[in-house]
């Protein structure tokens, strides 16, 4: 069955049951997610606006899917397996009486079960498992996943130690002057340069030595961490940000509504699942998209891919490749390509590398 192909997952509580205080609902849902993050590398964060991976909904009767609720008792809730759109969403029957305790239906216990489905688990035949199909109250203070639940979820996502393989765990700010520092994405935004890494970005105002580190979520709460590619069309005050098979449009530093959208709307074939790097060249009014060892060229005026692509990076950008992490355009004639902790200043008129630098050379390290 399907799984989330990322470790940072967002959720949003669409509406609140009147049966409980809002804070109690928030707490029950947060603790339910925590049950699963404790035994996997997954990290969950709540967002209040925009499109989350998992939408939590309280509804009664018919509510927009094929599975209308049935009044009090019977079906308490249901959740969809990982995926886009309705995928991952968890629906709770408002005709139940939701509680923080043993009376009525305990929201925390039900949510743990439904989030299991949201993460890709099916039902368990072990009566001690939270994924057993029938609801049974247990003391929430001593509640623990069964061995079967843990086995099931770790077969999909691995165990939490896998976090330690990541160069920067989610809660630590990468060291800016670490000689091994690499970036996920880099782009100009007006006279500034944004450097993205994990859930952080650094802001470099051109010609000034000072840089500041920020959480992506502090500037754009609806955007995910781990931005993988970015480019700017300065004349339109637009910045495009990419992660997995989705992209977001930022206009005048504000996220546009109705995003994210699929990267396939640019005309990529279905096998393209993510973009490594992207850069817009205002001289040609073309955007270059780098995917593995190839690149595509997109005509921003005609809003379509140029014919004859993809091409090999190594064939057309001498000394660059075979893959890159990030790239941006500067000073009317240079692309700055990032590969791991190295950076290459590339003159696109001369079509050659003119300088080799460390990736963090912009920060006076």
């Amino acid at each position: 069955g399907p799984v989330w192909r990322k470790h940072y997952i967002t959720y949003r509580i669409n509406n609140y049951t009147p049966d409980m205080n809002r804070e109690d609902v928030d707490y029950a849902i947060r603790k339910a997610f925590q049950v699963w993050s404790n035994v996997t590398p997954l990290k969950f964060s709540k967002i209040n606006t925009g499109m989350a991976d998992i939408l939590v909904v309280f509804a009664r009767g018919a509510h927009g899917d094929f599975h209308a609720f049935d009044g009090k008792g019977g079906i308490l809730a249901h959740a969809f397996g990982p995926g886009s759109g309705i995928g991952g969403d968890a629906h709770f029957d408002e005709d139940e009486f939701w509680t923080t305790h043993s009376g009525g239906t305990n929201l925390f216990l039900t949510a743990v079960h439904e989030i299991g489905h949201s993460l890709g688990l099916g039902h368990s035949s072990d009566p001690k498992a939270v994924m057993f199909p029938t609801y049974k109250y247990v003391d929430i203070n001593t509640f623990r996943l069964s061995a079967d639940d843990i086995r099931g979820i770790q077969s999909l996502y691995g165990d939490p130690k896998e976090n330690q393989r990541l160069p920067n765990p989610d809660n630590s700010e990468p060291a800016l002057c670490d000689p091994n520092l690499s970036f996920d994405a880099v782009t100009t935004v007006g006279n500034k340069i944004f450097f993205f890494k994990d859930r952080f970005f650094w802001l470099k105002v051109s010609e000034r030595p000072k840089t500041s580190v920020n959480l992506i979520s502090s500037l754009w709460p609806t955007l995910p961490s781990g931005i993988e590619a970015a480019y700017e069309i300065e004349a339109r005050n637009q910045v495009f940000l990419f992660k997995d098979d989705k992209y977001w449009l930022i206009s005048n530093l504000r996220p546009e509504p109705n995003y994210p959208k699929s990267i396939h709307s640019f005309g990529f074939p279905n096998f393209v699942k993510k973009i490594d790097a992207a850069v817009f060249n205002p001289r040609f009014y073309r955007t270059y998209f780098f995917v593995d060892n190839q690149y595509w060229r997109y005509d921003e005026r005609r809003q379509m891919m140029d014919p004859g692509y993809p091409k090999l990076i190594t064939k057309n950008f001498q000394g660059i490749g075979p893959k890159i992490d990030a790239v941006f355009y500067s000073k009317n004639k240079y692309y700055y390509f990032f590969q791991g902790s190295n950076q290459f200043e590339y003159d696109f008129l001369l079509q050659r590398i003119t300088k080799t630098l460390k990736s963090n050379s912009w920060f006076g390290c």
């Epitope: 499109m51 094929f66 249901h78 969809f80 397996g81 995926g83 759109g85 309705i86 995928g87 509504p257």
Partner: antibody
């Protein structure tokens, strides 16, 4: 490449029966919900029936409940619609459509067959 | 049961025009709304799912918005191949369709 190909349509008298088939290829058939959607001549789309990946859960529009039966054979990658007690108002092009993976149906029809025409007339 | 009301039922426009079609649900369906395009004699084609997500391979001139009960499909600059019938849908309910014709 995902492909759905319907067959079994034709002319049938009111009160008669017909069995439609939909042969699927290009995806893991047993992972997906599948549906039948119909379109009467010159009219809009009408959802008819859906079936879960295992075949354990089925759903029907009120207009066909008790007369139509949806089923699937995962070993043959084929979806079926058994139509009994046919009426003139069942005349339509019948499409099979693929939905999402998982325990519940999203009603998100990302791939459709070309359709097969069923005409109920005396 | 939830009802879906689509408007207008037909619409005349010219190549290059910006066109908006609306769909209203009788009660909240959150963002669980899809849009399809159908050309004569052809099967419907998924354009937008979950109210605003563009299906793979669909041109970016198509966009969707809305949540709760009110939804819109917008075509930013009509192309000759866009003249067709458009349907909104949630679960087992389709809108009546909007026929987009050349002016």
């Amino acid at each position: 490449e995902v492909q759905l190909l319907e067959s079994g349509g034709g002319l049938v008298q009111p009160g008669g029966s017909l069995r439609l088939s939909c042969a699927a290829s290009g995806f893991t058939f047993s992972d997906y919900w599948l549906h039948w959607v119909r379109q009467a001549p010159g009219k809009g789309l009408e959802w008819v029936s859906g079936i879960s990946p295992s075949g354990g859960m089925t759903m029907y529009a009120d207009s066909v409940k008790g007369r139509f039966t949806i089923s699937r054979d995962n070993s043959k990658n084929t979806l079926y619609l058994q139509m009994n007690s046919l009426r003139a108002e069942d005349t339509a092009v019948y499409y099979c459509a693929r939905d999402i993976v998982g325990p519940y149906s999203a009603g998100l029809f990302d791939y459709w067959g070309r359709g097969t025409l069923v005409t109920v007339s005396s | 049961d939830i009802q879906m009301t689509q408007s207008p039922s037909s619409l005349s426009a010219s190549v290059g025009d910006r066109v908006t079609i609306t769909c209203r649900a009788s009660q909240s369906i959150y963002t669980y709304l899809n849009w399809y395009q159908q050309k004569p004699g052809k099967a419907p084609k998924l354009l937008i799912y979950a109210a605003s997500s563009l299906q793979s391979g669909v041109p970016s001139r198509f966009s969707g918005s809305g949540s709760g009960t009110d939804f819109t499909l917008t075509i930013s600059s009509l192309q000759p191949e866009d003249f067709a019938t458009y349907y909104c849908q949630q679960a087992g309910i389709f809108g009546q369709g909007t026929k987009l014709e050349i002016k």
